[in-house]
């Protein structure tokens, strides 16, 4: 029988390269049993992680997997940085690994096709 401990499965040292102006959803996969824990996002500033109180978040349930999503609509240049999700469960605080967003400004990226465009040209 699976354990009912809450776990946060943000991949260790994961990185996401995204474009300013795009929409992006940062996923925190949350494993839990009966009661969904209270989950928050924070952004690392040096050694402290600053709670993101005023940002749009939502839960997504998909194929028996639960995600706590941090929405970037749109991505801004200052969204660059490292993020962590945390869960409060039975008075325990569980923290995820951090995940890093690398934001490319649209101005510098406007001449460059995206990875997907490059791939579709190459494999078409």
């Amino acid at each position: 029988k699976e354990s009912c401990d809450v776990q946060l499965y943000i991949k260790r040292q994961s990185e996401h390269s995204i474009l300013a102006g795009d929409r992006f959803e940062l996923e925190c996969p949350v494993k839990y049993c009966a009661n969904r824990p209270h989950v928050t996002w924070c952004k690392l500033n040096g050694t402290t992680c600053v709670k993101l109180e005023d940002r749009q978040t939502s839960w997504k349930e998909e194929k028996n997997i639960s995600f706590f999503i941090l929405h970037f609509e749109p991505v801004l240049p200052n969204d660059n940085g490292s993020y962590r999700c945390s869960a409060n469960f039975q008075s325990n605080l569980i923290e995820s690994h951090s995940t890093t967003l690398y934001v490319t400004d649209v101005k510098s990226a406007s001449e460059r096709p995206s990875k997907d465009e490059m791939a579709s040209r190459f494999w078409a």
């Epitope: 354990s3 401990d5 776990q7 946060l8 499965y9 991949k11 260790r12 040292q13 994961s14 990185e15 996401h16 390269s17 995204i18 992006f24 996923e27 996969p29 494993k31 998909e62 997997i65 995600f67 569980i94 690994h97 990875k115 997907d116």
Partner: antibody
Framework: EVQLQESGPSLVKPSQTLSLTCSVT????????WNWIRKFPGNKLEYMGY???????YFNPSLKSRISITRNTSKNQYYLQLNSVTTEDTATYYC????????????WGHGTTLTVSS | DIVLTQSPASLAVSLGQRATISCRAS??????????MHWYQQKAGQPPKLLIY???NLESGIPARFSGSGSRTDFTLTINPVEADDVATYYC?????????FGGGTKLEIK
């Protein structure tokens, strides 16, 4: 049900570039992590790398200078490119999906066998 | 890289008996609060098939004859009782740290 299918050449000459395709049905490659693994003739399994739901990639440092993984979300396919192949790259190549809750590989392709020979 | 050492390299077991395969990691596998150690079965000409995930959880559709245990650096796959269909090579894998790594495999034969 999730299915993965590798396709590509079975024979490549040394110094050439290997290009493989993994076609995915039953799930979107804009969700989860999508991996390449290879199995050498001596039965050793080697993890090569992944492309994530966002399009970000990770490569095994042992291959970093030679490997790239890209995707085409409209075709729901992802690709492996391995440059400057040698006979040491002779192996069976698999694509596989990682489960979010621990990254174990819950769905695999059948594999495609590659021989590098002149 | 985390090195996974499997033992024995090969194993011959009588039908109906217990098979035990060990996997020892060069570093502790517990950075997620649980153990990201998994077990696969590979038969000739087929891809690996997931048996056990996160050390002790049985994958859907896998018979309860298969079980996994262990934590930190020492993990075990047990097959009890062994059936003829279990002839295969078994691999452990860690996904705790990049690059993911596999054990060298244990070949199970029937005595």
């Amino acid at each position: 049900e999730v299915q993965l299918q590798e396709s590509g050449p079975s024979l490549v000459k040394p110094s050439q570039t290997l290009s493989l395709t993994c076609s995915v049905t039953g799930d979107s490659i804009t969700s989860a992590y999508w991996n390449w693994i290879r199995k050498f003739p001596g039965n050793k399994l080697e993890y090569m790398g992944y492309i994530s739901y966002s399009g970000s990639t990770y490569f095994n440092p042992s291959l970093k200078s030679r490997i790239s993984i890209t995707r085409n979300t409209s075709k729901n396919q992802y690709y492996l490119q391995l440059n400057s192949v040698t006979t040491e790259d002779t192996a069976t190549y698999y694509c596989a999906r990682s489960h979010y809750y621990g990254y174990y590989f819950d769905y695999w392709g059948h594999g495609t066998t590659l021989t590098v020979s002149s | 890289d985390i090195v996974l050492t499997q033992s024995p390299a090969s194993l011959a077991v009588s039908l109906g008996q217990r098979a035990t395969i060990s996997c020892r990691a060069s570093e502790t596998i517990d950075s997620y609060g649980d153990s990201l150690m998994h077990w696969y079965q590979q038969k000739a000409g087929q891809p690996p098939k997931l048996l056990i995930y996160r050390a002790s959880n049985l994958e859907s559709g896998i018979p309860a004859r298969f079980s996994g245990s262990g934590s930190r650096t020492d993990f075990t796959l047990t097959i009890n009782p062994v059936e003829a269909d279990d002839v295969a090579t078994y691999y452990c894998q860690q996904t705790d740290e990049d690059p993911y790594t596999f054990g060298g495999g244990t070949k199970l034969e029937i005595k």
